[in-house]
């Protein structure tokens, strides 16, 4: 059918409530494309009725709400004028809620559901609430250890929890709750976070600092080969991974077939006070599809990407 | 480091009660769920039931339903296991085992109390 | 709910033997829901093998766990005899929890 697929390896966890999930590919997206969706390999698209449980909203697949049956790979097909690419993604569901049973809850928990707070200091907890226009979300509620947080130390802002003068107590289970409408009806979202504290006040905190990339552009020629560090200083005694990531997904494993793009050996210097780590990115040849496309170094809960610009055509030359 | 401290052997008499206590320390005992098992003398374990600790939830295997009760006492840290009408086929070493969020296993066992129901 | 079946019952194995004993499931489960704990006589269970094939804290690396579905197997690539002991297998994924009957494994 002459489209490329994209294989998104990283699967979504998912309890049995609303969830959606968006088609983007900068820089495929960003222009005049159609998006359509896809379940298990199905000839027949997603349906577009907003009154179906399962539909297509724009370029958003969106489950009202998500069933056990629900799991498996679903794709989304998008055809520009003269391209079409076929998007992977592996979704598992799991039924049960932490605060009703730890049977059959979520294992082996995605960064999204892990946050840090910074003892002493005030901080925050974001709930990741991603739907499309069409679903309204109404206020948050916040539980801890599945009972719902009160008291002056916490404040409720959008989707956040402000924690103020943060206490070792403070670290545990906790769970953001909303009723999201749309159409009409309601359902609830409850995602689980499991929060720690940490209690380092060494080379700034433990919290990782990513010196290099800046959230910035790169200009590079087309067919080039490129070699960009992530250079991150953290304390002597973490245990943060550094890696590069893109579309949510480890390079090594995004282009596990092609091998155009990869991730280099980490090094490190030490300091007295703390160590550098440098990781690079490898492009072997640089395509296309690379611009555009957020190219993220993580390190721990720190983030930071490059995005590749073809030069701008130097008008001298003419 | 993380510790189940569970009561030492019991003997009982046949149609009494009994209650086993595991105390924890060295986690929050309030974030995590707490279960029972038994396992009775050379054969395999069977799993009782689980509460958790800050909202008292309780989830049990229907066979238990009746027999055991799960509490806790979330000021001494410690989760209790309640054992009514006992008879013989009660007799069993009950152990309770902790689960974290994220981590669906036994991670951490108490040392099991031997329970011995007799005349 | 969910039986899960272990085979075989009772085995022995000599020092440096490689070791295989298996657990089937009734019905299907999850790989991050499937568990193994040694037991040794006198002691209470121990986390051994995590979501299929993750090897507990401590645990040498002699060990491995594989499969998916309902066939799931604890490998010893080179018995010890400190590897004596009591296997159960354990599903996490629905209700009731369930054990194996366990895999008693002798030093020949």
């Known amino acids: 059918d002459g489209c490329k697929d994209i294989f998104m390896k990283n699967e979504i966890l998912s309890a049995s409530q609303p969830f959606a999930f968006n088609c983007t590919f900068p820089p495929i997206t960003s222009g005049e494309v159609s998006v359509t969706w896809y379940k298990n390999s199905s000839k027949i698209p997603v349906s577009k009725i907003i009154q179906s449980r399962i539909h297509q909203d724009e370029t958003w697949i969106l489950f009202l709400p998500m069933e056990w049956g629900d799991s498996g790979v679903y794709q989304c097909v998008i055809k520009g004028r003269d391209s079409c690419h076929r998007i992977h993604v592996n979704l598992t569901v799991f039924e049960k809620h932490w605060c009703d049973t730890s049977i059959g809850g979520l294992p082996n928990l995605s960064d999204e559901y892990k946050q840090i707070l910074h003892l002493g200091k005030d901080d925050s907890l974001t709930c990741h609430l991603h739907f499309p226009k069409s679903c309204v979300l109404g206020p948050i509620k916040w539980y801890k250890d599945c009972n719902e947080i009160k008291g002056e130390r916490f404040t409720v802002l959008e989707t956040r929890l402000l924690v103020s003068n943060v206490s070792a107590e403070d670290r545990g289970n906790y769970a953001c709750q909303a009723i999201l409408t749309h159409s009409g009806k309601q359902y609830e979202v409850l995602n689980g976070i499991t929060v720690s504290i940490t209690e380092r006040a060494g080379y700034g905190g433990s919290v990782p600092k990513i010196i290099y990339p800046k959230n910035h552009s790169i200009e590079v020629q087309l067919g080039t080969t490129l070699i960009v560090d992530c250079n991150v200083t953290d304390t002597k005694d973490n245990t943060n991974l550094r890696c590069w990531r893109v579309n949510n997904t480890l390079v090594d494993d995004y282009y596990d077939e092609s091998k155009r793009i990869r991730e280099g050996v980490e090094t490190h210097v030490s300091f007295r006070e703390h160590n550098l780590y440098t990781v690079n990115i490898t492009f072997l040849e640089v395509k296309m599809e690379d611009y555009g496309l957020p190219f993220m170094c993580h390190a721990g809960v720190s983030t930071a990407y490059i995005i590749l610009q073809l030069p701008a055509p130097d008008f001298r030359a003419y | 480091q993380v510790q189940l401290q569970q009561t030492g052997s019991v003997l009982v008499r046949p149609g009494t009660s009994v209650k086993l206590s595991c105390k924890a320390s060295g986690y929050t005992f309030t974030s995590s769920w707490m279960h029972w098992a038994k396992q009775r003398p050379g054969q395999g374990l069977e799993w009782i039931g689980e509460?958790?600790?800050?909202?008292?939830?309780?989830n049990y295997n229907e066979k238990f339903k009746g027999k055991a009760t799960l509490t806790v006492d979330t000021f001494s840290s410690t989760a209790y296991v309640d054992l009514s009408s006992l008879a013989s086929e009660d007799s069993a070493v009950y152990y309770c085992a902790r689960v974290d969020y994220g981590k669906p296993w036994f991670a951490y066992w108490g040392q099991g109390t031997l329970v011995t129901v007799s005349a | 709910q969910i039986v899960l079946t272990q085979s075989p019952t009772i085995m022995s194995a000599s020092p440096g033997e490689r070791v295989t004993m298996t657990c089937s499931a009734s019905s299907s489960v999850s790989s991050s829901y499937l568990h193994w704990y040694q037991q040794k006589p006198g002691s209470s269970p121990k986390l051994w093998i995590y979501?299929?094939?993750n090897l507990a804290s401590g645990v040498p690396a002699r060990f491995s766990g594989s499969g998916s579905g309902t066939s799931y197997s604890l490998t010893i690539n080179s018995m010890e005899a400190e590897d004596a002991a009591t296997y159960y297998c354990q599903q996490f994924q629905s209700s009731p929890l369930t054990f194996g009957a366990g895999t008693k494994l002798g030093l020949k």
């Open positions: 979501s299929t094939s």
């Open positions: 509460i958790h600790p800050n909202s008292a939830k309780t």
